[in-house]
C-alpha cells in the first residue's frame, strides 16, 4: 500500500467552443481506494475552482458546461489523487478552448457524376459545414479533406480541399462503385471523425442529361 501515482491530464476537447471536457489517466491507486479531484484557475485570476461536473463525460473526466466555459482565457488545470497514504498532483495543463475544438463531421454529402464538354467524366463531391459551426461569421474557419476508394481497393485516396466545400475527382474507372467520406478541421483544432460514407457507381456509358 502506497500513496497514489501521479495522474496525467491527457486530452481536452470541445465540440463547439461552448463546452469542453478534459480526461485524465489516473496512475496507480497504491492498492487503496483513491479519490480524484480536478481543480482549475484561469490566467490572471487568483481563484481556484473544482470541476463542475464529473459525471457527464464518463469516468476520469470533467465536463465544463456553457456557464463554465470562457474563450480567450487560458485555463490552468490540475488533477489531484488522494488516498489514506497520501496524495499526488498532475502537472498543470494549460488549455485555451479555442484550440481544442473537435467538430462534428461535415453534413449533406452529395455525389454527382458530371461530364465536361470533351466527354471526360468526373465525380463532383459537395458537402456542408457541420451544423454547430457558424462559418459565415468567421467564428470558425474550417478546412476539409475528402477520401474515396473503389469498393475493391484497400487504400483510401485523400484530397485536401482547403476551405472549399466541393471538389472534383477525375480519372475514375467506369463501372466501378466508389465510397466517399469527408472530415473537417477548424483553425488550431482537431480533425473531426470521418463522416457518413456515401457511394456512387461511375456509369460505363455516361451520357450528359439536359
Amino acid at each position: 500500500q502506497s500513496p497514489p501515482g501521479k495522474p496525467e491530464i491527457h486530452k481536452c476537447r470541445s465540440p463547439d467552443k461552448e463546452t469542453f471536457t478534459c480526461w485524465w489517466n489516473p496512475g496507480s491507486d497504491g492498492g487503496l481506494p483513491t479519490n480524484y479531484s480536478l481543480t482549475y484557475s484561469k490566467e490572471g485570476e487568483k481563484n481556484t475552482y473544482e470541476c463542475p461536473d464529473y459525471k457527464t463525460s464518463g469516468p476520469n473526466s470533467c465536463f465544463f458546461s456553457k456557464q463554465y466555459t470562457s474563450i480567450w482565457k487560458i485555463y490552468i488545470i490540475t488533477v489531484n489523487a488522494t488516498n489514506e497514504m497520501g496524495s499526488s498532483t498532475s502537472d498543470p495543463l494549460y488549455v485555451d478552448v479555442t484550440y481544442i475544438v473537435e467538430p462534428e463531421p461535415p453534413r449533406n454529402l452529395t455525389l454527382e457524376v458530371k461530364q465536361l464538354k470533351d466527354k471526360k467524366t468526373y465525380l463532383w463531391v459537395k458537402w456542408l459545414p457541420p451544423t454547430i459551426t457558424d462559418v459565415k461569421t468567421g467564428w470558425f474557419t474550417m478546412e476539409y479533406e475528402i477520401r474515396l476508394k473503389s469498393e475493391e481497393a484497400d487504400e483510401w485516396e485523400i484530397h485536401f480541399t482547403g476551405h472549399q466545400t466541393q471538389f472534383k475527382v477525375f480519372d475514375l474507372y467506369p463501372g466501378q462503385k466508389y465510397l466517399v467520406q469527408t472530415r473537417c478541421k477548424p483553425d488550431h483544432g482537431y480533425w473531426s471523425r470521418w463522416g457518413q460514407e456515401k457511394s456512387i457507381e461511375i456509369p460505363n456509358d455516361f451520357t450528359l442529361k439536359d
Epitope: K11, G44, I74, L93, Y94, V95, Y99, I100, Y190, W191
Partner: antibody, heavy 120, light 107 residues
Framework: EVQLVQSGAEVKKPGSSVKVSCKAS????????MHWVRQAPGQGLEWIGE????????NYNQKFKDRATLTVDKSTSTAYMELSSLRSEDTAVYYC?????????????WGQGTLVTVSS | DIQMTQSPSSVSASVGDRVTITCKAS??????VAWYQQKPGKSPKLLIY???NRYTGVPSRFSDSGSGTDFTLTISSLQPEDFATYFC?????????FGGGTKVEIK
C-alpha cells in the same frame, strides 16, 4: 518528469540532408504539438515548424517549407526534423520544443539541442 | 512576417538592480507574446506567456506589461542566476518569430 532527448551532433556536406530526432518521455506524446527551432552560432532563435503528433498535421515557416520535413513515430514517442539541400548558413543548434499546453504556441519544454555543422 | 525588435541588445547591471527589456512588434499581436531566458550552452527556458502570465515556478521578480505592439519584461531585483540572454516571441500569426535577444551582463 518531462524530457525531450535529441540525437547527437552532426557534420554534413553542403547539398546533403540531416535528420534530427527528439525522443519524448514523461507525458502522453500525442497530447501536445511539437515545434522545431534553430539557433545559429551567437544568433537569435528561428522557428522552423510544428507538428501535431496525434495526426501528423504540420505547419511550416515558409522559409523552410521546401526543405524541412517534420514527422513523428508514435510507437516510440519520437519526433523528427529532416532538413535537405543543406548550405553553410544552416549551421546551427536545432531544438525540439513542446507546446506549453493545449493552446497557443509558447514552448515550455526544450530538448538539449543538436548542433548541425555544414561544411565542405 | 512579424518582426520582434528587442532593445537594448545588451545591458550591464548589478545584483539587486531593476532591469527593463523592451520588445516591439512590427504589427499588432494582442497579448500573444512569450519571454524566455537562455544561459550559455543551454536551452531556452519559458518565463512568461500571454504577455503577462508567469509560467509555473517562475519567480515573481519577473513580470511583463504591455499589449498590442509594445512589451516590457521587468526583473524587479536582479539575482545572480538572472545573468543570461532574454528573448521575446510572438505567437499571434505564422510564422512564430523571436526577438534578437537581450544579454544581461554583470556590471
Amino acid at each position: 518528469e518531462v524530457q525531450l532527448v535529441q540525437s547527437g551532433a552532426e557534420v554534413k556536406k553542403p547539398g546533403s540532408s540531416v535528420k534530427v530526432s527528439c525522443k519524448a518521455s514523461g507525458y502522453t506524446f500525442t497530447t501536445y504539438w511539437m515545434h522545431w527551432v534553430r539557433q545559429a552560432p551567437g544568433q537569435g532563435l528561428e522557428w522552423i515548424g510544428e507538428i501535431d503528433p496525434s495526426d501528423s498535421y504540420s505547419n511550416y515557416n515558409q522559409k523552410f517549407k521546401d526543405r524541412a520535413t517534420l514527422t513523428v513515430d508514435k510507437s516510440t514517442s519520437t519526433a523528427y526534423m529532416e532538413l535537405s539541400s543543406l548550405r553553410s548558413e544552416d549551421t546551427a543548434v536545432y531544438y525540439c520544443a513542446r507546446n506549453g499546453g493545449l493552446g497557443p504556441a509558447w514552448f515550455s519544454y526544450w530538448g538539449q539541442g543538436t548542433l548541425v555543422t555544414v561544411s565542405s | 512576417d512579424i518582426q520582434m525588435t528587442q532593445s537594448p541588445s545588451s545591458v550591464s547591471a548589478s545584483v539587486g538592480d531593476r532591469v527593463t527589456i523592451t520588445c516591439k512588434a512590427s504589427q499588432y499581436v494582442g497579448t500573444a507574446v512569450a519571454w524566455y531566458q537562455q544561459k550559455p550552452g543551454k536551452s531556452p527556458k519559458l518565463l512568461i506567456y500571454s504577455a503577462s502570465n508567469r509560467y509555473t515556478g517562475v519567480p515573481s521578480r519577473f513580470s511583463d506589461s504591455g499589449s498590442g505592439t509594445d512589451f516590457t519584461l521587468t526583473i524587479s531585483s536582479l539575482q545572480p542566476e538572472d545573468f543570461a540572454t532574454y528573448f521575446c516571441q510572438q505567437y499571434s500569426s505564422y510564422p512564430w518569430t523571436f526577438g534578437g535577444g537581450t544579454k544581461v551582463e554583470i556590471k
